[in-house]
């Protein structure tokens, strides 16, 4: 479970076709 103070930070994960991109790479989303 994320700490409360982390709530509004983006979380970054590896994924494919994410973050408006066609390939695989890191993607950070709030």
């Amino acid at each position: 479970r994320r700490r409360r103070r982390d709530t509004h930070f983006p979380i970054c994960i590896f994924c494919c076709g994410c973050c408006h991109r066609s390939k695989c790479g890191m993607c950070c989303k709030t």
Partner: antibody, heavy 121, light 107 residues
Framework: QVQLVESGGGVVQPGRSLRLSCAAS????????MHWVRQAPGKGLEWVAV????????YYADSVKGRFTISRDNSKNTLYLQMNSLRAEDTAVYYC??????????????WGQGTMVTVSS | SYELTQPPSVSVSPGQTATITCSGD??????ACWYQQRPGQSPVLVIY???KRPSGIPERFSGSNSGNTATLTISGTQAMDEADYFC??????????FGGGTKLTVL
């Protein structure tokens, strides 16, 4: 100017611990993911760990998982690497590197000068 | 386990085009980056997202990535380009791979 300065390296015996620091300046430290990358003498680059914006969002290479801990103190603009149970194969120059800005930070866009860690009895 | 493979060395004459390859399983499905490391210095990012150049990197550096191979091309190679070059790509959140490096010699 944008700068990363590592410190804390040295000679340490196998099984002992060491903590590396990386002081950042010239940019908003809290707005960037930060990595540790190492390079054994005469060898290539090996990624070690990353800490993203949230303290809970961190990842490690299999070779160091369970032994190394990455952390950051945004109030001090400093990145850390706590290295426990050190082995001879951990001997390397350790670089801190900034992750690229933006929602898709695949690259390491700024590197420090590195600090040498030698594990030897 | 995945790995990225580069030729250990590449030689080129001044003013000619140097081509450095990086091969890996399904590498073209992920974004590749390239770093230059001069002797005794820290790495410098020269290409990201396959073909994009950071500010301050000369136009003679270009990149491409498809299939299983990413390519770094240096046009009009200069003596100052002599260095080690490393490719890099993400294969998972806990697996960032670097190639073994290619030593570029400008004859």
């Amino acid at each position: 100017q944008v700068q990363l300065v590592e410190s804390g390296g040295g000679v340490v015996q196998p099984g002992r611990s060491l903590r590396l620091s990386c002081a950042a300046s010239g940019f908003t430290f809290s707005s960037y993911g930060m990595h540790w990358v190492r390079q054994a003498p005469g060898k290539g680059l090996e990624w070690v760990a990353v800490i993203w914006y949230a303290e809970s969002n961190k990842y490690y290479a299999d070779s160091v998982k369970g032994r190394f801990t990455i952390s950051r103190d945004n109030s001090k603009n400093t990145l850390y690497l706590q290295m426990n149970s050190l082995r001879a194969e951990d001997t390397a120059v350790y670089y801190c590197a900034r992750a690229q800005e933006g929602i898709a930070p695949d690259a390491f866009d700024i590197w420090g000068q590195g600090t040498m860690v030698t594990v030897s009895s | 386990s995945y790995e990225l493979t580069q030729p250990p060395s590449v030689s080129v004459s001044p003013g000619q085009t140097a081509t450095i390859t990086c091969s890996g399983d399904k590498l073209g499905e992920r974004y590749a980056c390239w770093y230059q490391q001069r002797p005794g210095q820290s790495p410098v990012l020269v290409i990201y997202q396959d073909s994009k150049r950071p500010s301050g990197i000369p136009e003679r550096f270009s990149g491409s990535n498809s299939g299983n191979t990413a390519t770094l091309t240096i046009s009009g190679t200069q003596a100052m380009d002599e260095a080690d070059y490393f490719c890099q790509a993400w294969y998972s959140s806990t697996n960032v791979l670097f190639g073994g490096g290619t030593k570029l010699t400008v004859l």
